[in-house]
C-alpha cells in the first residue's frame, strides 16, 4: 500500500508541493489522516498527520469544547493508494457564524498563542490580546495549554494561549479520536505566561480551616476531641481527572464535515489568524 | 474561472527596487499557498518564494534571499513580491502561481522585470 | 545547474512515443517528494500538466503520462501531435534547500 505521507504545523507541512508519498510496510493495509482545528476567539489553527495507518477504514468526526476553546477532529483511514488526503485542512468548518466586531473588549489581556510554534510560545514573548464577551458568553480568563494530535504514528503538538470563559480551571482537557487539548485557567491580565506547573482554586470551594488546638484539660485523657462549626475541609488535589466533554456540539456547524469550496480542493495550509473579531 | 494578473514590472538599475503585486479572482485566496516563479530571458524557470495561506510560512530560493520579500494581503487578494538590491541576474519575467492539487496549478501570464544601467 | 536533471532536447515524429526523464537525488525524489510534471507552449506561461507523480488535470489528454521510482520520474507522451512541441519541466520540493526546484526543462520538437 502507498499513501501520503506529511506533518502539519499550523500551515506549513502538509502544503501541496511538500507533499510525500510512502510505501507502508507489510501489513499494513489502510491509510489515515487525522486533522485537529482549534479555534480561540482570536483566531484558529490546525495540525494534521497522514501517513499509513493502522485499524480499518472508516470515518470519525467530533467537535469539542474546552471552556469556550473550539476544537473539531477529523479522522478518516481509507484503504486504496494514496487514499489519504480527502480532508480539508483549512479549519473552515470552525469559522465564526456572525459577525462579533461589535463585541467591545472587556477589560482582561491575555497571552496569545494561534498556530504558533512552541519558541515563540514562551513566557511573555508571545502576542497579547483583549478579550471580548462572544455568543452570550463571558470571556474573561486566560489559558495557557497544548494541543496534541497522534495518528500514523506520529505525535503533533503545538501550544495554545488566549481567553476563555474559566477564570481557574486546573489542568483540564477534552479528547476526541488521537487528540487532545489540555490545559489550565487562571483571572487577571496576562495571568497566562507559564500555568504548567501552576494550581488554582475556585473561590467557590470553601477554605481551608485551621482548628484551634484542644482546650488544656486536668482530667488524664488518652482522647482528645475537637469541634468546629466551621464549613468542613476539602480534600486538596494538585490535580484532577480529565471531565468528559461537557459538550459534543458546542456551537452550530462545529460537527459537521469541513465545508468544501466548488473551486478544486485546496489541500494545503491551515486558515490561521482568522480574527473571530473581524 | 481562476485569473492570476501580475503587474509592477519594468526597467530598473541594478541595486534598485520594485514591488511585483498580482491579484488573484475566482477562488478563496485566503486558503491557497501562494509563489513567485521566475524564468529568465531564454532560460528555464526558477521557483523564487512561497507563502502559506496565512502569511506566517515563508520560504525563499537561497539566490533571492535577504533582498526579497513576499507578503500577502488576504483582504485584497493580493500577492506581492518586494525586490530590493535588484541584480542583472533577477532580469525575468516574474509569475505568481497558485498551489492547487499539490502543485502550481494556476499560473499568471507573467510581468518582466530588466535590471541593467 | 538545476537541481533537478532533465534532458536539454528530445524530439519524435507525428504518432511517436517520446520520454522525457527528470533525476534528482535523495533530497527532493529520492526523498518521497511528488514529483509535477508543466508544459510550457512557445510565449505563454507553464501549465500544469501531470501532478502527484502521475495524475493529470481535467482537460490534459491520456497521452500524457508520469511515473516515478527511486530518485527518478519520468513523462511519456505517446501519439505524439504537432501542439506537443513545447518545454516541459519537472518539479518537486527539496529538503535541503527548503524550497521547490524545477528541472532545467526539455525542449519537445516535433519532426516532419
Known amino acids: 500500500l502507498e499513501c501520503y505521507s506529511c506533518v502539519q504545523k499550523a500551515d506549513d507541512g502538509c502544503s501541496p508541493n511538500k507533499m510525500k508519498t510512502v510505501k507502508c510496510a507489510p501489513g499494513v493495509d489502510v491509510c489515515t489522516e487525522a486533522v485537529g482545528a482549534v479555534e480561540t476567539i482570536h483566531g484558529q489553527f490546525s495540525l494534521a498527520v497522514r501517513g499509513c495507518g493502522s485499524g480499518l477504514p472508516g470515518k470519525n468526526d467530533r467537535g469539542l469544547d474546552l471552556h469556550g476553546l473550539l476544537a473539531f477532529i477529523q479522522l478518516q483511514q481509507c484503504a486504496q493508494d494514496r487514499c489519504n488526503a480527502k480532508l480539508n485542512l483549512t479549519s473552515r468548518a470552525l469559522d465564526p457564524a456572525g459577525n462579533e466586531s461589535a463585541y467591545p473588549p472587556n477589560g482582561v489581556e491575555c497571552y496569545s498563542c494561534v498556530g504558533l510554534s512552541r519558541e515563540a510560545c514562551q513566557g511573555t514573548s508571545p502576542p497579547v490580546v483583549s478579550c471580548y464577551n462572544a455568543s452570550d458568553h463571558v470571556y474573561k480568563g486566560c489559558f495557557d495549554g497544548n494541543v496534541t494530535l497522534t495518528a500514523a504514528n506520529v505525535t503533533v503538538s503545538l501550544p495554545v494561549r488566549g481567553c476563555v470563559q474559566d477564570e481557574f480551571c486546573t489542568r483540564d482537557g477534552v479528547t476526541g479520536p488521537g487528540f487532545t487539548l489540555s490545559g489550565s485557567c487562571c483571572q487577571g491580565s496576562r495571568c497566562n505566561s507559564d500555568l504548567r506547573n501552576k494550581t488554582y482554586f475556585s473561590p467557590r470551594i470553601p477554605p481551608l480551616v485551621r482548628l484551634p488546638p484542644p482546650e488544656p484539660t486536668t482530667v488524664a485523657s488518652t482522647t482528645s476531641v475537637t469541634t468546629s462549626t466551621s464549613a468542613p475541609v476539602r480534600p486538596t488535589s494538585t490535580t484532577k481527572p480529565m471531565p468528559a466533554p461537557t459538550s459534543q456540539t458546542p456551537r452550530q456547524g462545529v460537527e459537521h464535515e469541513a465545508s468544501r469550496d466548488e473551486e478544486p480542493r485546496l489541500t494545503g495550509g491551515a486558515a490561521g489568524h482568522q480574527d473571530r473579531s473581524n | 474561472e481562476v485569473q492570476l494578473l501580475e503587474s509592477g514590472g519594468g526597467l530598473v538599475q541594478p541595486g534598485g527596487s520594485l514591488r511585483l503585486s498580482c491579484a488573484a479572482s475566482g477562488f478563496t485566496f485566503s486558503n491557497a499557498w501562494m509563489s513567485w516563479v521566475r524564468q529568465a530571458p531564454g532560460k528555464g524557470l526558477e521557483w523564487v518564494s512561497y507563502i502559506s495561506s496565512s502569511g506566517s510560512t515563508i520560504y525563499y530560493a537561497d539566490s533571492v534571499k535577504g533582498r526579497f520579500t513576499i507578503s500577502r494581503d488576504n483582504s485584497k487578494n493580493t500577492l506581492y513580491l518586494q525586490m530590493n538590491s535588484l541584480r542583472a541576474e533577477d532580469t525575468a519575467v516574474y509569475y505568481c502561481a497558485r498551489e492547487g492539487l499539490w502543485a502550481f496549478d494556476y499560473w499568471g501570464q507573467g510581468t518582466l522585470v530588466t535590471v541593467t544601467s | 545547474q538545476s537541481v533537478l536533471t532533465q534532458p536539454p532536447s528530445a524530439s519524435g515524429t507525428p504518432g511517436q512515443r517520446v520520454t522525457i526523464s527528470c533525476t534528482g537525488s535523495s533530497s527532493n525524489i529520492g526523498a518521497g517528494y511528488v514529483v509535477h510534471w508543466y508544459q510550457q507552449l512557445p510565449g505563454t506561461a507553464p501549465k500544469l500538466l501531470i501532478y502527484?507523480?502521475?495524475k493529470r488535470p481535467s482537460g490534459v489528454p491520456d497521452r500524457f503520462s508520469g511515473s516515478k521510482s527511486g530518485t527518478s520520474a519520468s513523462l511519456a507522451i505517446s501519439g505524439l501531435r504537432s501542439e506537443d512541441e513545447a518545454d516541459y519541466y519537472c518539479a518537486a520540493w527539496d529538503d535541503r534547500l527548503n524550497g521547490a526546484v524545477f528541472g532545467g526543462g526539455t525542449k519537445l520538437t516535433v519532426l516532419g
Open positions: 502527484d507523480n502521475n
